[in-house]
C-alpha cells in the first residue's frame, strides 16, 4: 500500500496503485524517438536503441513504431499511456510481454506498431506470423 509518509496529492497521475493499493512502479523502455532503421523483411529486429528510460508515469507502456515509405525506414521507440491513442491508434496489446508488430492502415507508407509491458520489451520487435494471435492455428494451441 501507499506508505503513510508518501503524500498522495490530488489528481496525481504520478502515483498509480494496483488492485491491492500498492504503488505501481514505472516501466523501463527503449526510448530513442524516431531513428533510421535497416530492419526490413525480417521476422524480428532489435531496436539498436542504446537509451533505456524510466517512463515518466507508471501507467505508461513501451511502444515501437516501424514505418517504411519510398525514401526510408524508421523505427520509433517511446513510452506512452495506453489510455491515449498513439499516431491515432489505440494500443490494444499494451499488456503483452512481447512487442508483436501489427500493421495499421496509413496512406503512402507501410506502418506497423506494437506495445508491451515488460522491461525493455520494445527492444525486440517481432513481425513473425507465428506470434500473431490472429493466426487460427495458434489460437487452437492457446485454448487447448
Amino acid at each position: 500500500t501507499i506508505p503513510p509518509h508518501v503524500q498522495k496529492s490530488v489528481n496525481n497521475d504520478m502515483i498509480v496503485t494496483d488492485n491491492n493499493g500498492a504503488v505501481k512502479f514505472p516501466q523501463l523502455c527503449k526510448f530513442c524517438d524516431v531513428r533510421f532503421s535497416t530492419c526490413d523483411n525480417q521476422k524480428s529486429c532489435m531496436s539498436n536503441c542504446s537509451i533505456t528510460s524510466i517512463c515518466e508515469k507508471p501507467q505508461e507502456v513501451c511502444v515501437a513504431v516501424w514505418r517504411k515509405n519510398d525514401e526510408n525506414i524508421t523505427l520509433e521507440t517511446v513510452c506512452h499511456d495506453p489510455k491515449l491513442p498513439y499516431h491515432d491508434f489505440i494500443l490494444e496489446d499494451a499488456a503483452s510481454p512481447k512487442c508483436i508488430m501489427k500493421e495499421k492502415k496509413k496512406p503512402g507508407e507501410t506502418f506497423f506498431m506494437c506495445s508491451c509491458s515488460s522491461d525493455e520489451c520494445n527492444d525486440n520487435i517481432i513481425f513473425s506470423e507465428e506470434y500473431n494471435t490472429s493466426n487460427p492455428d495458434l489460437l487452437l494451441v492457446i485454448f487447448q
Epitope: D18, V23, K24
Partner: nanobody, 120 residues
Framework: EVQLLESGGGLVQPGGSLRLSCAAS???????RMWWVRQAPGKGLEWVS?????????YYADSVKGRFTISRDNSKNTLYLQMNSLRAEDTAVYYC?????????????WGQGTLVTVSS
C-alpha cells in the same frame, strides 16, 4: 520484517553535492531491483533512478542524467545515490524502494525518506 533506512539528506547550496544511503535489513536485497524516488513539496512522486540486482545496469530520469549516480553494495545491503550539481528543483524527500523483480508490479518496501533541501 523488512526495513529500509535512508540517510544523508540535508541543506546544500546550488551546485553542491550530497550522497544518500539506504540501508536494508530483513530483505532479499541482493535479488531485488532498487529505486530512488523523490517527492517535492506538494508534488507527485518522481522516479529518479533504478539499479538492477547485479549493480551493473542503471537507469535515470532525464531530469537527473549526468548529475546523479546510483550504486549499491550488496555485501552491505546498502543502496547509494551520489547527487552532484544540485539545483533548487532537486529539493524533495528522497525515498528508497525495493522491487521484487520476479513478477511484482508494485513497490514492495519503502523507506521513511530523507529530506534534501537545495537553497542558497
Amino acid at each position: 520484517e523488512v526495513q529500509l533506512l535512508e540517510s544523508g539528506g540535508g541543506l546544500v547550496q546550488p551546485g553542491g553535492s550530497l550522497r544518500l544511503s539506504c540501508a536494508a535489513s530483513g530483505s532479499t536485497f541482493t535479488d531485488d531491483r532498487m529505486w530512488w524516488v523523490r517527492q517535492a513539496p506538494g508534488k507527485g512522486l518522481e522516479w529518479v533512478s533504478a539499479i538492477q540486482p547485479d549493480g551493473h545496469t542503471t537507469y535515470y530520469a532525464d531530469s537527473v542524467k549526468g548529475r546523479f549516480t546510483i550504486s549499491r553494495d550488496n555485501s552491505k545491503n546498502t543502496l547509494y545515490l551520489q547527487m552532484n550539481s544540485l539545483r533548487a528543483e532537486d529539493t524533495a524527500v528522497y525515498y528508497c524502494a525495493e522491487q521484487d523483480v520476479k513478477g511484482s508490479s508494485s513497490f514492495d518496501y519503502w523507506g521513511q525518506g530523507t529530506l534534501v533541501t537545495v537553497s542558497s
